[in-house]
């Protein structure tokens, strides 16, 4: 048996090309230059090669760069990134919007694999924050990106690329990420009109205090139950039955049908049964009259 | 001399799980590919998977999931993990040698092991 | 997804006949198929690889034939000890197909 470890007679690869998909595999190793093949890393996408055959190159490139790629070929990876693990991922130095925009390219209508994430990682810790390009692009690939982050990463997060994010953008949001996103948006739309700055806030009220929902019911919002019913419980609980009804507007009238649910049942609770009965819903479970509420946390705060 | 010994199997009810191992003597596995074939009984060969002397490992579409080809060099050892197994996985498998030194399954598969019986039954 | 398929799947054939086998996938392959040949109770013998080129030891009454998609493995004169199983395998795509190997071609006495 041949030792098949040199390149035959006249099989040395001159240029990355589509002859290349009739090698052998231990072919491709032994005839295909890893430095021809990094210059042309932008040609194998267009030629037809198997999965194992993908291995080998892959393979080629790992031992020219044991350190990892270098982002001029990293750029041009296309469907060899679907073979990288998060370790060689971890080698990268990607700085380049551009060349994360091509990897995310790849990956396009996937869920986000540990690769991607592994890639998004490196590239946000490079820039050393959460710009408003990058998050445009992250959300656009994917809309649940922002929810996937902890509340410490999204502390990174400027106000100015706040405006790069959409409603759909927070559908995943838990209230931790939410109360971290809120002020954030707060002084990112601090310069608009009452209606367009509602329009603009509305998704990240899960994470807004008392006090803001306060002043929004004094500006005519008409706040929809959705989401009113994704409000933080603590913040809703202090309001009254007026500033709830201006802040629901015409809306109000859905609080009957989410009675049994949070936050509407506890907020119910702490309400006094006649200032429920002025809203003619029929809401139950508030304070008999005639019954004393002490507020013990404000006691405690006093002590 | 090329040699090749399959062990491990045996009976196992379904739902179970087994481990195949193939002790290989004569040559270096860092050298070359190895895969697994089986052969339910009265049947053709079918195709289960090979892992390349790189350590890249490639399986029939039927297999993936539920079956795990890795290896060992310095034991000279490779291993079929086989999980959630049904009647239908009862056949002797098959370990058997990249025929080429270049490390891929380029021509064909030689040497072969004598095979090891796994039958799958309550 | 990548199949291949073997015919006939059984034949009957004397001592001295000359037998041919054919196999055909379902998409270019160029040169990378192999044939075996096995016995009942024993592991698959390998014959032939790239098609034409014969496995050390193998008799050279076995030849192979064919690239692309159609192939053939031809015994000039069967003897004795030819009365097997054969089996064609593609080697060119080993990952996510259904199998590699052909459905398989018995030949026994007439």
């Known amino acids: 048996e041949v030792e098949k470890t040199a390149c035959p007679s006249g099989k040395k690869a001159r240029e990355i090309d589509e002859s290349l998909i009739f090698y052998k595999k231990w072919e491709l190793e032994a005839c295909v230059d890893a430095a021809l093949l990094a210059t042309q890393m932008d040609r194998v996408n267009a030629i037809p090669f198997t999965y194992e055959q993908l291995d080998v190159l892959k393979h080629k490139l790992d031992e020219l760069y044991p350190q990892g790629y270098p982002e001029s070929v990293i750029q041009h990876l296309g469907y060899l990134f679907l073979k990288m693990s998060p370790e060689d991922i971890r080698k990268w130095n990607v700085t380049s919007l551009e060349t994360l925009k091509a990897l995310l390219e790849v990956n396009k209508g996937h869920e986000m694999s540990p690769q991607v994430a592994t890639l998004i990682d490196r590239f946000v810790k490079g820039r050393g924050q959460l710009d408003k390009d990058t998050l445009d692009t992250l959300t656009a690939f994917y809309p649940g990106y922002l929810c996937s982050l902890s509340p410490e990463e999204l502390s990174s997060v400027p106000p100015s690329s706040i405006w790069a994010v959409r409603p759909q953008d927070l559908d995943t949001c838990d209230p931790r990420q939410l109360d971290v996103l809120y002020p954030k948006a707060r002084l990112a739309f601090q310069n608009m009109n009452g209606s367009e700055y509602f329009v603009k806030i509305q998704s990240f009220l899960g994470g807004a205090p008392t006090e803001d929902l306060k002043a929004l019911s004094q500006q005519n919002v008409s706040m929809d139950l959705a989401t009113f019913m994704k409000l933080r419980t603590d913040a809703v609980l202090p309001l009254t039955v007026a500033e709830v009804q201006k802040l629901l507007g015409p809306h109000v009238e859905g609080l009957k049908a989410e009675e049994r649910h949070r936050p509407v049942r506890d907020w119910i609770l702490r309400q006094r049964q006649d200032d429920l009965d002025t809203l003619g819903l029929g809401l139950q479970g508030g304070i008999p009259n005639g019954y004393l509420v002490l507020d013990l946390s404000m006691q405690e705060a006093l002590s | 001399q090329s040699q090749l010994v399959e062990s491990g199997g045996g009976l196992v009810q379904p739902g179970g799980s087994l481990r195949l191992s193939c002790a290989v003597s004569?040559?270096?596995?860092?050298?070359?590919?190895m895969g697994w074939v089986r052969q339910a009984p009265g049947k053709g060969l079918e195709y289960i998977g090979y892992i390349s002397k790189i350590g890249t490992t490639y399986y029939a579409s039927w297999a993936k999931g539920r079956f795990t080809i890795s290896k060992d060099n310095s034991k000279n050892t490779v291993y079929l993990q086989m999980n959630s197994l049904r009647a239908e996985d009862t056949a002797v498998y098959f370990c058997?040698?990249?025929?080429?030194?270049?490390?891929?399954?380029?021509?064909?598969?030689?040497?072969w092991g004598q095979g090891t019986l796994v039958t799958v039954s309550s | 997804a990548l199949q291949m398929t073997q015919s006939p799947s059984s034949l009957s054939a004397s001592v001295g006949d000359r037998v041919t086998i054919t196999c055909q996938a379902s998409q270019s392959i160029s040169n990378y198929l192999a044939w075996y040949q096995q016995k009942p109770g024993k592991p698959p013998k390998f014959l032939i690889y790239d098609a034409s080129d014969l496995a050390s030891g193998v008799s050279s009454r076995f030849s192979g034939s064919g690239s692309g998609t159609d192939f053939t493995l031809t015994i000039s004169s069967l003897q004795p000890e030819d009365f097997a199983t054969y089996y064609c395998q593609q080697v060119y795509d080993s990952n996510n197909v259904e199998n590699v190997f052909g459905t398989g071609t018995k030949v026994t006495v007439l």
């Open positions: 058997a040698r990249g025929s080429s030194s270049g490390g891929y399954l380029d021509d064909g598969f030689d040497p």
């Open positions: 004569g040559f270096s596995l860092s050298s070359y590919a």
